[in-house]
């Protein structure tokens, strides 16, 4: 998964509470002995702070050693500090565990900024708010890293929810979703709910706060409105998906559908932006600005480098238009829509002016290595990686940033032909995905 | 080429409204590449910058000052203008009118600024 | 709230002297900053943007560097001209707001 600029991204406290979620839309699919349902013990199981990562609580070792974990489907390995660093509040004691085992192997992972490296290993691993089982599974106990912690992010180690293929050193080290579901009998799927804050939080409101949730083997009717639609799983290395077509504020980008998925198209919990290919963002931009052009804002705005700030609660959202991203429905030429609004586009930003305002970076930015839908798109939906199936579905987030005027929005169908030939098909030559 | 000019009263009693205008000259306030800006500076200290003004009427606003400052814009004459209200003592300072360009980001052309003294 | 501290608050040098002033930000402001020059009884002059581009019509001897947090405004050869405040701005944070204290550069 692409650190450096990937990881990791912002949650916080819920857009709507529980008390004022959005009424459901639609009835609700026929029920899934065993995949819906209610999953209390999982509501609410993710921390998180502006820009820097979703993490959930997990256990390693005998006796149980607590560690927060960045959760991220945009990688494959499970790999968690195991040696002391600054950045580190606490890390993985190998020597502690009784049932650690080592496979004498080592691993190393490079990042276009960074990377890490480690020693590959066996242990007992739950999830405290998840389900109730302990597997063994691959850990990378990382002994050396370099900008891949982060000061203050409050998580010591990652958790790569794709699949196999993309796994390091290679695709024969399982990772641990596969493991989990092969040693228990937790369905072949899990969902995400990423609540973004809308504004920044501070270290105090951080820990206190509630970042989403992941559910583990289900989906919870709770956290989203409306229904669910899915998109297929295009191959299964990251979730990789296809987009067929792009509007701002309902106009069409107008470009052939290749160009949105050059050279891939992922859902990745672990970027914090929407990255499009060069050719889309500066259309997309272009777009933006056009729709925008009340108001003029610098370049280094654009690009994702200046914040803009408002006085506090004068956000002037109207201006910026809506993104809508249309992906290959389950059915023959049938597409659906998401829908995002500013609020998700726009990312809160804290300690940069006065408390009287309210600062953001504009989180799209650009991308060498295809279309990724970070957080900006995870924080409008719930989003189910129903891996069982082969496909990813998309709800209105329960918890999602919105004003009064507008909602993000999950709609279809809509009648789209020849959407097959909207995927790149990449050489076999050129699979050297981290190294973006 | 382009020039920035201040003019308005030079004395303002405490508590009234202090009001200056700016008149560009040599060049069109409707110029997309530009905002408009105010800065001021009291006798003997640094800047403080006051706001900003795009030609349609979009504006920024210093949070300190916020509650009593406006900023307009008159394409037609050419022209931007700041009031500041409930003025004091301490509002006592030359005020410039500013070109904020360089793709919006810098202060690339001043007025020469206008002394305002606020005194009974 | 971002902070700009500049220092020395003066700088006492004679003509054909090197002069360097500092510019210090709070927190990381990546190249996102500007000098400006002000002599007395005249509006301030911008010198410097993104941190070392040389505005239309600056000399030479007038250059800038640094990037994040710490920020230098270098004269080469000080001319009887150059004698004045200078003042350096971020613009990080838009639209741009926060100036430094000011360093004035005197004949010694």
């Known amino acids: 998964t692409q650190h450096g600029i990937r990881l990791p991204l912002r949650s916080g406290l819920g857009g709507a509470p529980l008390g004022l979620r959005l009424p459901r839309e639609t009835d609700e699919e026929p029920e899934e002995p065993g995949r819906r349902g209610s999953f209390v013990e999982m509501v609410d199981n993710l921390r998180g702070k502006s820009g820097q990562g979703y993490y959930v609580e997990m256990t390693v070792g005998s006796p149980p050693q607590t560690l927060n974990i960045l959760v991220d489907t945009g990688s494959s390995n499970f790999a968690v500090g195991a040696a002391p660093h600054p950045f580190l509040h606490r890390y993985y004691q190998r020597q502690l565990s009784s049932t650690y085992r080592d496979l004498r192997k080592g691993v190393y992972v490079p990042y276009t900024q960074g990377k890490w490296e480690g020693e590959l290993g066996t242990d007992l691993v739950s999830i405290p708010h998840g389900p109730n089982v302990t597997v063994r599974a691959n850990i990378a106990a990382i002994t050396e890293s370099d900008k891949f912690f982060i000061n203050g992010s409050n998580w010591e180690g990652i958790l790569g929810l794709a699949y196999a293929e993309i796994a390091r050193p290679d695709d024969s080290l399982e990772p641990f979703f596969d493991s989990l579901v092969k040693q228990t009998h937790v369905p072949n799927l899990f969902s995400l709910q990423l609540c973004g804050a809308g504004f920044p939080l501070n270290q105090s409101e951080v820990l206190a706060s509630v970042g989403g949730s992941m559910i583990i083997g289900g989906i919870d009717h709770s956290l989203y409105t409306g229904s669910l639609w899915y998109t297929p799983i295009r191959r299964e290395w990251y979730y990789e998906v296809i987009i067929v077509r792009v509007e701002i504020n309902g106009q069409d980008l107008k470009m052939d559908c290749k160009e949105y998925n050059y050279d891939k198209s992922i859902v990745d919990s672990g970027t914090t932006n929407l990255r499009l290919p060069k050719k889309v963002f500066e259309a997309a931009v272009k777009s933006i600005k056009a729709a925008s052009s009340t108001e003029k804002f610098p370049d280094g705005f654009w690009l994702g480098e200046q914040l803009v700030c408002w006085q506090a609660g004068t956000t002037p959202w109207n201006i910026f238009p809506v993104i809508s991203l249309y992906l290959m429905g389950e059915v023959t030429n049938q597409s659906f829509r998401i829908t995002i609004l500013p609020q998700q586009y726009l990312r809160p930003v804290e300690d940069v002016a006065t408390s009287q305002d309210d600062c953001y970076k504009f989180a799209i930015s650009q991308s060498s290595t295809g279309t990724v839908m970070g957080a900006v798109i995870m924080e409008g939906f719930y989003v189910v990686f129903d891996r069982a199936r082969k496909r990813i579905g998309f709800a209105v987030s329960a918890c999602h940033v919105h004003d009064e005027f507008r909602t993000a929005a999950v709609e279809g169908p809509f009648v789209t032909l020849d959407m097959e030939d909207c995927g790149y098909n990449i050489p076999q030559t050129d699979e050297s995905t981290l190294m973006t | 080429q382009l020039q920035l000019q201040e003019s308005g009263p030079g004395l303002v009693k405490p508590s009234e409204t202090l009001s200056l205008t700016c008149t560009v000259s040599?060049?069109?306030?409707?110029?997309?590449?530009?905002?408009w800006s105010w800065i001021r500076q009291p006798p003997g200290k640094g800047l403080e910058w006051i706001g900003n003004?795009?030609?349609?009427?979009?504006?920024y606003y210093n949070p300190s000052l916020k509650s009593r400052v406006t900023i307009s814009v008159d394409t037609s004459k050419n022209q931007f203008s700041l009031k500041l209200s409930s003025v004091t003592a301490a509002d006592t300072a030359v005020y410039y009118c500013?070109?904020?360009?360089?793709?919006?980001?810098?202060?690339?052309?001043w007025g020469r600024g206008t002394l305002v003294t606020v005194s009974s | 709230e971002i902070v700009l501290t500049q220092s020395p608050a003066t700088l006492s040098l004679s003509p054909g002297e090197r002069a360097t002033l500092s510019c210090r930000a709070s927190?990381?402001?990546?190249?996102?900053l500007a000098w400006f020059q002000q002599k007395p009884g005249q509006a301030p002059r911008l010198l410097i943007y993104?941190?070392?581009n040389r505005a239309t019509g600056i000399p030479a001897r007038f250059s800038g560097s640094g990037s994040g947090t710490d920020f230098t405004l270098t004269i080469s050869s000080l001319e009887p001209e150059d004698f004045a405040v200078y003042y350096c701005?971020?613009?990080?944070?838009?639209?741009?707001?926060?100036f430094g204290g000011g360093t004035k550069v005197e004949i010694k």
């Open positions: 500013a070109r904020l360009g360089h793709g919006y980001n810098y202060f690339d052309l």
């Open positions: 040599g060049g069109s306030i409707s110029w997309s590449s530009y905002y």
């Open positions: 003004i795009y030609y349609s009427g979009s504006t």
């Open positions: 927190q990381s402001v990546s190249s996102y």
């Open positions: 993104d941190a070392s």
């Open positions: 701005q971020q613009v990080y944070v838009w639209p741009p707001r926060t």
